[in-house]
């Protein structure tokens, strides 16, 4: 019989990994550069995808066990990898807060249409941060 | 139980353009899942060369020459490989991974194809 | 390029026990699958990147990973188990990638 699977982590404790890893970081992984990918087309997979190469990195090994672990799930999970962009490299701290930004809006809305909506959500959490501040 | 099957020429001549075609019964092709080509020379190893699923993803050897297509009407999915060469002369399988991580866990029994004018 | 490496050539006697192993630095992040192909046949997988036995495949076969090596062990050697095995792993570049593939040798 299969080997016993561990359970997939839920979006909640994702998304608390990458605002862990993020907080108060200007870099990850040495400034290291990876792909930027389109999130909208599996985003697990996808960010998946543009990490594998990361190694020897301890930052982000938790957040790669919990991209593979979401991407082994199912199709019925929609976790398909995107047609990968060769264009355009990022740091990883950049794709991990893309990744971050996008997951939210899973979280909160259900879903999320793009990178329109990446932007979107960044201008709210941008005005939500400034708000707070002036206010406190 | 899900089968696929590799049609092809068998043989094509030196600058010509390969067309094979996988029919998949059983089953249904569609953007759920990795719909691959993999080929294997002459006593050498395995070479994966691209999947479709929804998208395309093509191993960056064949980039330029290479074009996987699916038609989910006829239930199969297609590849076409440009400027052949005598070292195109492979066995060229099809076949189907269930999630992106998890492996090819359907194959085709493979067709061969020989390029020799 | 990446690169996925196998030992070329493993040998054991009936009842016996081998291990296969495959090296690459993305093995760590998303571990490997491991196909066998017998001679003249297409290959099969046989244990996926989550250690995962494919059904139908004997418990004889395992798959384990530690750092940035995979192994595949078959225990209970059977001559039917004489083929070629293949991992398989991820490159951000290049896909999918095959390792060169492990001959294994049933002796006497």
């Known amino acids: 019989s299969p080997s016993p699977v561990t359970p997939s982590p839920t979006l909640k404790e994702l998304i608390e990994e990458l605002v862990n890893i993020t907080q108060n970081q200007a870099s990850l992984c040495n400034g290291s550069m990876v792909w930027s990918v389109n999130l909208t087309a599996g985003m697990y997979c996808a960010a998946l995808e543009s990490l594998i190469n990361v190694s020897d990195c301890s930052a982000i090994q938790r957040t790669q066990r919990m991209l593979k672990a979401l991407c082994s799930q199912k199709p019925a999970a929609g976790q398909i990898s995107s047609e990968r962009s060769r264009d355009t490299k990022i740091e990883v701290i950049q794709l991990v807060k893309n990744l971050l930004t996008y997951v939210r809006g899973v979280y909160r809305h259900g879903n999320f249409r793009g990178l329109n909506d990446i932007f979107e959500a960044q201008k709210i959490e941008w005005h939500e941060h400034h708000h707070h501040h002036h206010h406190h | 139980e899900l089968t696929l099957q590799e049609s092809g020429p068998g043989l094509v001549k030196p600058s010509q353009t390969l067309s094979l075609t996988c029919v998949v019964s059983g089953g249904s092709v569609t953007s759920n899942y990795y719909w691959n080509w993999i080929r294997q020379r002459p006593g050498r190893g395995l070479e994966w060369m691209g999947y479709?699923?929804?998208?395309?993803n093509y191993n960056p050897a064949f980039q330029g020459r290479i074009s996987i297509t699916a038609d989910t009407a006829k239930n199969h999915f297609s590849l076409q490989l440009t400027s052949m060469t005598t070292e195109d002369t492979a066995v060229y399988y099809c076949?189907?991974?269930?999630?992106?991580?998890?492996?090819?866990?359907?194959w085709g029994h493979g067709t061969s194809l020989f390029v020799s004018s | 390029s990446y690169v996925l490496t196998q030992s070329p050539s493993v040998s054991g006697s009936l009842g016996q026990t081998v291990t296969i192993s495959c090296s690459g630095t993305?093995?760590?992040?998303?571990?490997a699958n491991w196909y066998q192909q017998l001679p003249g046949k297409a290959p099969k997988l046989l244990v996926h990147s989550d250690g995962g036995r494919l059904s139908g495949v004997p418990d004889r076969f395992s798959g384990s990973e530690s750092g940035n090596s995979a192994a595949l062990t078959i225990t209970g050697l059977q001559a039917e188990d004489e083929a070629d095995y293949y991992c398989?792993?991820?490159?951000?570049?290049?896909?999918?990638?095959f390792g060169s593939g492990t001959q294994l040798t049933i002796l006497g």
């Open positions: 993305t093995i760590g992040v998303v571990g």
């Open positions: 479709w699923t929804g998208s395309t």
């Open positions: 076949a189907r991974a269930s999630t992106w991580l998890h492996g090819m866990d359907f």
């Open positions: 398989q792993s991820f490159d951000t570049t290049l896909g999918y990638v």
